[in-house]
């Protein structure tokens, strides 16, 4: 028989965690698991429990995590990696819409994330969406063009800036930008 199926690993309430705020990492395998192993990759740090409660997020805890479990002498496949990001490490960028935050359905709009610092990575989040749009950019601004806008693009957007040298240490979120599709 082959390896045991991989467990799931999630961060609650979110994998984007403001500094000093709590977060829980939870590894979930089948019932009756003998042992869990939760590890922080590239650090030699681990624990042999399914749940890691972080009472206050710190830079040292940001990074990639994965977990696995053992039943008898068999180990499971590792979970998908979880990227735990500390936010609020740097000052917030500004987010703007060109030509403006009100756009007609079928029109085009570009969301621009701008920072005073030399960050080369930007992430754009739409409230309610599970994953960000990421955009590497050589300069101090990142453009996120939205071609042929539909009603589904309406909503609240925020962006973050960070450096590819420390990809899990992000800025505070920009002030929210409300995109209105008419």
């Amino acid at each position: 028989s082959g390896p045991l199926p991989k467990p799931s690993l999630q961060a609650l309430p979110s994998s984007l965690v403001p500094l000093e705020k709590p977060v829980t990492l939870r590894c979930q395998g089948p019932p009756g698991v003998d042992l869990y192993r939760l590890e922080k990759l590239s650090s030699s740090r681990y624990q042999d429990q399914a749940v890691l409660f972080i009472p206050a997020m710190k830079r040292s805890l940001a990074g990639r995590y994965r977990c696995s479990y053992q039943n008898g002498s068999l180990w499971s496949l590792p979970s998908d990696q979880l990227e735990l990001v500390a936010t609020g490490v740097f000052a917030k960028p500004s987010l703007s819409a060109q030509p403006g935050p009100a756009v007609s359905s079928g029109g085009d709009v570009t969301l621009q994330c701008q920072t005073r610092y030399g960050f080369d990575q930007f992430a754009l989040y739409k409230e309610g969406d599970p994953a960000p749009y990421k955009n590497p950019e050589r300069w101090y601004r990142a453009s996120f063009p939205i071609i042929t806008v539909t009603a589904a693009h309406s909503g609240t957007y925020r962006c973050y800036s960070f450096s590819s040298r420390d990809p899990y240490l992000w800025s505070a979120p920009s002030d929210p930008l409300e995109l209105v599709v008419t």
């Epitope: 650090s43 030699s44 740090r45 624990q47």
Partner: nanobody, 129 residues
Framework: QVQLQESGGGLVQAGGSLRLSCAAS????????MAWFRQVPGKEREFVAV?????????DHADSVKGRFLISRDNARHMVYLQMNSLNPEDTAVYYC?????????????????????WGQGTQVTVSS
Amino acid sequence: QVQLQESGGGLVQAGGSLRLSCAASGVTFDSAAMAWFRQVPGKEREFVAVISTESGGRTDHADSVKGRFLISRDNARHMVYLQMNSLNPEDTAVYYCASSLLYCSASGCYANRDSYDYWGQGTQVTVSS
């Protein structure tokens, strides 16, 4: 709110002893590794000793303090201690208590300050000759 509060520092004559204490709150104390570091102005923070809960409380001490300093912990009281004997002027520094939420699997990992998540404000130890 996670808090580590050191106490017990002070001025002592060379050859004397001090006992540092660190009170921890807000962390799952019995699953954490606890350590002492020290720092002299203008220098890197230096590992002194660590005690973890794995294998019944494994300890490790920096070579410079082995045989003179001893780390211990009281899980019931959420305290960690550093008993310092045969002090010499080179031990003069600010001493910091640190806590790690995770264990280390590699040699030297516990001596790396990046392996610790929470830090106290420090207590000054001055050894006069």
